[in-house]
């Protein structure tokens, strides 16, 4: 059978400073069991952008409704974008465990920030 795929359809997104950026991510299966997290950058120095269970991410909201059943849409919106937010964002599926382990990453979406229109 098909293994879960993490789909980030947009290779790049360009947003004007001060606006919101929507980063799209869907998965093709509800298994394996485990959370989705968003990161900026790759490797050990990557920055956690959103983790549904722990942490405080005041600029990030989830696109899908919190009560949506069998949700496979893990897109996020980041508000009040600044040039410091530029980078490549990865949607990552984890396999549940102690601790959770990375299972599969999306291909990434590069966010570029345009100057605020005058």
């Amino acid at each position: 059978e098909e293994e879960l795929q993490v789909i980030q359809p947009d290779k790049s997104v360009s947003v004007a400073a001060g606006e919101s950026a929507i980063l799209h991510c869907t998965v093709t299966s509800l298994i394996p069991v485990g959370p989705i997290q968003w990161f900026r950058g790759a490797g050990p120095a990557r920055e956690l952008i959103y983790n549904q269970k722990e942490g405080h991410f005041p600029r990030v909201t989830t696109v899908s409704e919190s009560t949506k059943r069998e949700n496979m849409d893990f897109s996020i919106s980041i508000s009040n974008i600044t040039p410091a937010d530029a980078g490549t964002y990865y949607c990552v599926k984890f396999r549940k465990g102690s601790p959770d382990t990375e299972f599969k990453s999306g291909a990434g979406t590069e966010l570029s920030v345009r100057a605020k229109p005058s």
Partner: antibody, heavy 120, light 108 residues
């Protein structure tokens, strides 16, 4: 309509083995986690085990004795129970896992259950 | 392991009465609570998930509320078919999934 039908229960002696099956229909079996939940006579509900893809999870009380597995080509969930004990006597329910938003899991469909009795 | 404590253990009520069940978690589970109804000789049936969302086909006399550690299931006007045992379950932190001990609703 979602249907879950358990089979394989019966009476066994302590130390013996039993394999339960759960035939699923009415949903895309291969993309959902599935679970076993049991209920001892006159008692409450106790989670036993969950399987995702090849990821498996067990209650401490059955770890090392029970094995959960699935055959997606047959839409069937299994529970292999070895080294059975008197305290494993219960109705065993097969349940489909469900998720909501970014979190989960709870159980939105249950079979009618199959009774396992462990007695000498 | 998160422990769920349901109270009371038994409720004796008459049809038409308002019924409230309590479920208390030993630690914060946010809104990751489900409620089930089980009638004698039957499998459990999902009523509420995410603390307050009714499952498909569940009558609106059933409602859930709460977050954190304290949760409530309310039946606004008990019908004869509502008698049975009600269980809460947490899915915030697992394994193991844990259930409360149940509240039995009897006819007064």
């Amino acid at each position: 309509d979602v249907q879950l039908v358990e089979s394989g229960g019966g009476v066994v002696r302590p130390g013996e083995s039993l394999r339960l099956s759960c035939a699923a229909s009415g949903f895309s079996f291969s993309i959902y986690a599935m679970s076993w939940v049991r209920q001892a006579p006159g008692e409450g509900l106790e989670w036993v085990s969950t399987i995702g893809a090849d990821d498996t999870y067990y209650a401490d009380s059955v770890k090392g004795r029970f094995t959960i597995s699935r055959d997606n080509s047959k839409n069937t969930l299994y529970l292999q129970m070895n080294s059975l004990r008197a305290e494993d006597t219960a109705v065993y329910y097969c349940a489909k896992d469900s998720t909501v938003g970014w979190s989960g899991d709870f159980f939105d469909y249950w079979g009618l259950g199959t009774l396992v009795t462990v007695s000498s | 392991e998160i422990v769920l404590t349901q109270s009371p253990a038994t409720l004796s009520v008459s049809p038409g009465e308002r019924v409230t069940f309590s479920c208390r978690a030993s630690q914060n589970v946010r809104s990751d609570i489900a409620w089930y109804q089980q009638k004698p000789g039957q499998a459990p049936r999902l009523l509420i998930y995410a603390a307050s969302s009714r499952d498909t086909g569940i009558p609106d006399r059933f409602s859930g509320s709460g977050s954190g550690t304290d949760f409530t299931l309310t039946i606004s006007s008990l019908q004869s078919e509502d008698f049975g045992v009600y269980y809460c379950q947490q899915y915030y932190d697992w394994p193991p999934f844990t259930f409360g001990g149940g509240t039995k609703v009897e006819i007064k």
